[in-house]
């Protein structure tokens, strides 16, 4: 931009150098050149000379008018045509910006990833503002009434060291820019309720050579949380439909899950966990791909026996990703043998 220009006069903007997108804007140029009575005053936007809606107000001043200015940024400067000068003479320049006041931040969520030492808060910022917009995260102890504030652009990580005086907090986000200010709804947070267990990882899988081959998936986590509830989802790489298995886990040892799967097929597995009874899930683990072995016996594969899992009193359900472009929109399969269970938080979907 043209922020450090030496002006021989002045340039000013009405309603201001930062204004709401779509407003009518007047930009004034006033020359204060020595030894020059300008024949003409010219306006340039982003280096291009403007031709229309220019008014000469008096000998020293001209104005350009824009109807419904809608560019986020522009670099304006004006020049004078001085008699006897071959080139135009620079008078002044200004950066101008248009944008929107911020929306109220929505979907405020705060979590503590186990072992991270931070509380991470995220929110939806709403529609683009096109101008510099800051977010002030307010964290107020419900026990001591003390309030801390943190500046952020899109999310914030707050050290749990600074949250030692209390377990219960009120959190809200204030969005601020030159055109306005909005507050999110307040979120009640109990630090013990927002911990997400340390990442779960599928380490390996093997398919046995039994008469009815079974696939055993091994997976683990370094979590210290005792009561953990997990989901494992799996599907063939050619399929849109995930089957989801739910179970309680105890990570003092490596977890083993048994599956009876279609032979000679490539499967994708992912797992995620949460502290039992709590709200926040881990993101799905990295996709783990496993190829089941070819069928050796004469037994015919019966598709209705898929997808059964060798773990009693647990739920298997199926969810279908509607399209690869919208991985978070899930559609339940209407098969009577399955209880619907949406696999949300689906950031790592495979086609």
């Amino acid at each position: 931009g043209i922020t450090s220009i030496n002006c021989s006069g002045d340039m000013w903007v009405e309603p201001g150098e930062i204004f709401q997108m779509g407003m009518n804007v007047s930009i004034y140029c006033q020359e204060a050149l020595k030894h020059c009575r300008p024949r003409n005053l010219y306006f340039y936007k982003n280096g291009f000379k403007e031709e229309f809606d220019i008014t000469r107000i008096n000998r020293t001043t001209a104005r350009i008018w824009y109807k419904g200015f809608s560019e986020p940024h522009a670099y304006m400067h004006c020049t004078a045509e001085c008699p006897g000068h071959f080139q135009e003479t620079l008078i002044c320049g200004k950066d101008i910006s248009s944008g929107h006041p911020p929306d109220a931040p929505s979907n405020l969520t705060c979590v503590i990833y186990e072992y991270s030492g931070n509380m991470t808060c995220t929110w939806n910022t709403g529609k683009p503002t096109y101008i510099d917009t800051k977010y002030i995260v307010h964290v107020k102890s419900l026990e001591t009434e003390e309030e801390q504030q943190y500046l952020a652009s899109s999310y914030v990580k707050i050290s749990t060291d600074s949250l030692q005086g209390s377990r219960k907090y009120l959190v809200w986000v204030q969005a601020v820019n030159s055109l306005g200010m909005e507050n999110s709804q307040q979120l009640h947070v109990h630090l013990d309720d927002i911990v997400i267990p340390s990442a779960s990882i599928i380490s390996r899988a093997e398919t046995t050579n039994d008469t009815v081959p079974k696939t055993i998936v091994y997976w683990k986590s370094k979590t210290m949380i005792e009561k953990v509830f997990c989901e494992m989802r799996y599907k063939t790489t050619t399929n849109q439909t995930w089957s989801v298995k739910e179970f309680d886990a105890n990570f003092t040892y490596v977890q083993q899950s048994e599956f009876y799967l279609e032979p000679d097929s490539k499967y994708v597995f992912q797992v995620r966990c949460q502290e039992t009874g709590k709200r926040n899930w881990q993101p799905w683990s990295s996709p783990f791909v496993h190829q089941t072995s070819q069928e050796t016996g004469k037994r015919n594969w019966q598709p209705w026996s898929s997808p059964f899992v060798h773990q009693t009193s647990q739920t298997v359900s199926q969810v279908t990703a509607k399209s690869s472009h919208e991985p978070q929109k899930m559609e339940m399969l209407s098969a009577t043998i399955f209880r619907g269970h949406p696999a949300s938080g689906n950031h790592q979907d495979i086609g």
Epitope: I136, Q148, Q149, Y150, L151, A152, Q174, V176, M181
Partner: nanobody, 116 residues
Amino acid sequence: QVQLQESGGGLVQPGGSLRLSCAASGFTFRLSAMRWVRQAPGKGFEWVSGIDSRGSTIYADSVKGRFTISKDNAKNTLYLQLNSLKTEDTAMYYCAQGVYGDTYSGSQGTQVTVSS
């Protein structure tokens, strides 16, 4: 209780510089966000700049690129460096707790006068 004491104001020519200080006590300064506000003669309070406990900063458009806010947790002191001063910066300057807002907590302030 919370106590804030501003200093460093004075008379300066346009284009000149000043450094304002705000000595704080009565609260945990290192965990506190702070701000500067000002009041020009005959006008209301105007928020100038803010800083959070980790040193992230925010400025009013009118001072962006000219003023710099900072804090020294070891000295429990908030600063505002004023450069390229203009006559319209003439005001009483106050520090307060919190990043943002055009109110202040009743400290005495420090006068900045920009005049040729």
